[in-house]
């Protein structure tokens, strides 16, 4: 048959951050091509990345339609130049991915401190509300729009002159913290979804310190 040298895809892996979602697999193709299909548990299969020699497929457009759904993908293997050919059972070779629920599993991207403003002994630290590729009414939603109060941020802050750290949490994108007058502080934030059991925390944001560009000081 024409499928003699065709091998099934394996190690199907979802790579997803802030809902940007790519399915990856192995092996690098030798004389074969791949097509990916994706569906929800109750939905129809939709084909993507037709007859590709890549070993990844961007499925973001499909999963953002409903990030709370659970998705399954499968990767079909075809002989290069003979994509009509089927396996011995009359079906092309394919392998299923693990199930993937974007809302529960997408990684939280590294947050960014948008600004901080000092007024006397208070500092307001604002976290950038990152835009996702999830849409509602033709507009892209932010991370906060999607997760609502399920998303919190943890702030770490410390005096530039010392190593002793403090922490604060917020269920918005802003922190209002007390600081000692005349001291410079450094800040780093982390996104957290406390209700999750996996992929709960982001990596820390880059550290921002008072006396640098992003800050503003008022007596």
């Amino acid at each position: 048959s024409g499928t003699t040298n065709t091998v099934a895809a394996y190690n199907l892996t979802w790579k997803s951050t802030n809902f940007k979602t790519i399915l990856e697999w192995e092996p690098k193709p030798v004389n074969q091509v791949y097509t990916v299909q994706i569906s929800t548990k109750s939905g129809d299969w939709k084909s993507k990345c037709f007859y590709t020699t890549d070993t990844e497929c961007d499925l973001t457009d499909e999963i953002v339609k409903d990030v709370k759904q659970t998705y399954l993908a499968r990767v079909f293997s075809y002989p290069a130049g003979n994509v009509e050919s089927t396996g011995s059972a009359g079906e092309p070779l394919y392998e299923n991915s693990p199930e993937f629920t974007p809302y529960l599993e997408t990684n939280l991207g590294q947050p960014t401190i948008q600004s901080f403003e000092q007024v006397g002994t208070k500092v307001n630290v604002t976290v950038e509300d990152e835009r996702t590729l999830v849409r509602r009414n033709n507009t892209f939603l932010s991370l906060r729009d999607v997760f609502g109060k399920d998303l919190i941020y943890t702030l770490y802050y410390w005096k530039s002159s010392s190593s002793g750290k403090k922490t604060a949490k917020t269920n918005t994108n802003e922190f209002l913290i007390d600081v000692d007058k005349g001291e410079n502080y450094c800040f780093s934030v982390q996104a957290v979804i406390p209700s999750r059991t996996v992929n709960r925390k982001s990596t820390d944001s880059p550290v921002e310190c008072m006396g640098q560009e992003k800050g503003e000081f008022r007596e």
């Epitope: 943890t154 770490y156 403090k166 922490t167 949490k169 917020t170 269920n171 982390q190 709960r200 925390k201």
Partner: antibody, heavy 117, light 107 residues
């Protein structure tokens, strides 16, 4: 099943130091925050400090700064509390607890430390 | 630092009574408040998280309410196993602070 298993009872001399351990099972400590809480006999609960095992950040109540040192070893899924220059004031039960972000949701069984000459 | 004032420090009640314990924070803690039950010789047990959410396995007679600076734990109908000490904890900002505790005793 999520569990926090703490090390055993300690009887130590004044001026000594002690290192308490708290081994997590059923979860990965670097996905959470780990805290230590002190309870003296017949007294309330006092937060000593906490640690984010993912990045090594540790925070302390100012009254325990210099007394306590909180660390974590992600390879063994264990959090540690070291107490130095022990006095009778440090005689207490010490609890470790996991912080989900919403609460300290799981607690160890407690470790008793008695400082006596 | 945020102070947590818990009241009453003790109360006597009968089985079936409705019991209310309050915690007042010295500043807004944005619902980062949890409630714990502790029995002698045991570790604290989580009852309520994020001010109003019931922890897994906790009977529905326990409920939490409040926001901003004022929070309440209610036991709608006290049961024999509920006689214990109760603590609130604010974890919105370090240093985290516990309330002083409320000992619920049998009348």
């Amino acid at each position: 099943e999520v569990q926090l298993q703490q090390s055993g009872t300690n009887l130590v001399r004044p001026g000594a130091l002690v290192k308490l351990s708290c081994k997590g099972s059923g979860f990965n400590i670097k996905d959470y925050y780990m805290h230590w809480v002190k309870q003296r006999p017949e007294q309330g609960l006092e937060w000593i400090g906490g640690n984010d095992p993912a990045n090594g950040h540790s925070m302390y109540d100012p009254k325990f700064q210099g007394k306590a040192s909180i660390t974590a070893d992600t390879s063994s899924n264990t959090a540690y509390l070291q107490l130095s220059s022990l006095t009778s004031e440090d005689t207490a039960v010490y609890f470790c607890a996991r912080d989900s972000g919403y609460a300290m949701d799981y607690w160890g069984q407690g470790t008793s430390v008695t400082v006596s000459s | 630092d945020i102070q947590m004032t818990q009241s009453p420090s003790s109360l006597s009640a009968s089985v079936g009574d409705r019991v209310t314990i309050t915690c007042k924070a010295s500043q807004d803690i944005k619902s980062f408040l949890s409630w714990y039950q502790q029995k002698p010789g045991k570790a604290p047990k989580l009852l309520i998280y994020y001010a109003t959410s019931l922890a897994d396995g906790v009977p529905s007679r326990f409920s939490g309410s409040g926001s901003g600076t004022d929070y309440t734990l209610t036991i709608s109908s006290l049961q024999p196993e509920d006689f214990a000490t109760y603590y609130c904890l604010q974890h919105g900002e370090s240093p985290y602070t516990f309330g002083g505790g409320t000992k619920v005793e049998i009348k």
